[in-house]
């Protein structure tokens, strides 16, 4: 978790002098509770936006927006703590809006936004806005939270972001898998424009079951420049196991930008259709 272009952070708006500060996620009001505290944020909204860094890289960011309730507690609002928790790593990052002037009611509802938390593809975050000071131990909570899922690199808008492109999102291998005679599979895919090796991972399963009955790995050496964007054809030999008929073919590239952590593409071959009714067994066996 990180912030995008930390230098450009602003929270001031007409009628309010405000500064954005780094936060330890442990506001002073936790340790030294105040008697009078503001009410919670209203209408917390989160959207996925995209922002360029000064270097020109494009990153997905969480656009966080909320409004204030129109009650008298606005007079005791000193700021807000914005917290983003990445659920699979438990990593948390916070910033603090520090109000340098008193808020006053005006003709329209106060609205705040922040769009500088960089988020990763295919990750889930808990986004929380806490009004400051935080409530006394038994006080009503004055925060709002939402669990936000970021699309993966298959998503059309995500595909062109720097983290997705770095993991090979622009490569479309257009995999085709064909079942041949004599327990073989022909796998065909389009090579990318990089002289790097690939790995084909074959996993076979019985019909309707999820534990594998056969696994095989096939190494494809790095193509020469004249082979870039060409089709690569590989024939894989299957183990002759009856019922081991559903095959998942996964292609793992090793691009220089992502090494052994590149996006993998896969294709599946289903078991052949079984006839609904079994063939009738004759009640006599012919002798000829």
């Amino acid at each position: 978790l990180r912030l995008l272009d930390h230098r450009a952070l602003v929270c001031s708006q007409p009628g309010l002098n405000c500064t954005v500060k780094n936060s330890t996620c442990l506001d002073d009001s936790w340790i030294h509770p105040r008697n009078l505290t503001p009410s919670s944020p209203k209408d917390l909204q989160i959207q996925l936006h995209f922002a360029h860094t000064q270097q020109g890289d494009l990153f997905p960011v969480a656009h966080i927006e909320w409004t204030l309730q129109t009650d008298a507690s606005i007079l005791y609002l000193e700021g807000a703590e914005l917290s983003v928790l990445q659920l699979n790593t438990n990593e948390r990052l916070c910033v603090r809006f520090e109000f340098l002037s008193k808020l006053r009611h005006h003709h329209r509802r106060w609205r705040f936004t922040f769009s500088h938390f960089v988020v990763d593809p295919d990750q889930e975050y808990e986004v929380t806005v806490h009004h400051l000071p935080k409530p006394i131990p038994d006080g009503d909570p004055n925060h709002q939270s939402k669990n936000f899922l970021v699309p993966d690199c298959e998503h059309a808008r995500m595909k062109v972001t720097t983290p997705c492109m770095s993991s090979g999102s622009l490569w479309d291998p257009n995999i085709t898998v064909e079942t041949l005679e004599a327990h073989q599979l022909r796998v065909s895919f389009t090579l990318w424009n990089e002289s790097t090796h690939y790995q084909i991972l074959l996993t076979s399963f019985p019909h309707m079951e999820n534990h594998s009955c056969f696994e095989h790995m096939h190494h494809i050496p790095a193509p020469r420049p004249e082979e870039f964007h060409q089709r690569s054809n590989v024939t894989l030999t299957l183990r002759n196991l009856k019922g081991c008929c559903r095959h998942q073919v996964q292609i793992q590239p090793f691009f220089s930008s992502c090494l052994n952590d590149c996006l993998r593409h896969s294709a599946t071959v289903s078991c052949p259709e079984m006839p609904d009714t079994p063939e009738p067994i004759p009640d006599y066996m012919p002798l000829w």
Epitope: I46, A62, E65
Partner: nanobody
Framework: QVQLVESGGGLVQPGRSLRLSCAAS????????MHWVRQAPGKGLEWVSG????????DYADSVKGRFTISRDNAKNSLYLEMKSLRDEDTALYYC???????????????????WGQGTLVTVSS
């Protein structure tokens, strides 16, 4: 322009099933999370279910959990709601709604809904 058209509503007996469809046009369906929202007669709007852009994440209101199933077919630009074991209290006008922003939030909307269908009426009565 963006259009959402619901269908599949009707009169059904308690305990029976119904399948609602929502046909989307005017935008790329696989970019956005989609939701079903309902309004019972004389009541306010109630969020029913949501599904992420690729169908990987599904969420339901407690009142329908275990009975309703949301799904989508991006190739057909369609959203569905399979409703089983229907109850009298499921009687409502059912709307499909498009999430305004990109991304998906568990248990409801991340931002707000910027487009709604005209609704399809589901009446559960014996």
């Amino acid at each position: 322009q963006v259009q959402l058209v619901e269908s599949g509503g009707g009169l059904v007996q308690p305990g029976r099933s119904l399948r609602l469809s929502c046909a989307a046009s005017g935008f790329s369906l696989d970019d956005y999370a989609m939701h079903w929202v309902r309004q019972a007669p004389g009541k306010g709007l109630e969020w029913v279910s949501g599904i992420s852009w690729n169908g990987g994440s599904l969420d339901y209101a407690d009142s329908v959990k275990g009975r309703f199933t949301i799904s989508r077919d991006n190739a057909k630009n369609s959203l569905y709601l399979e409703m089983k074991s229907l109850r009298d209290e499921d009687t409502a006008l059912y709307y499909c709604a498009k999430e305004k922003g990109l991304g998906y939030c568990r248990g409801g909307s991340c931002s707000s809904f910027d487009y709604w269908g005209q609704g399809t009426l589901v009446t559960v009565s014996s």
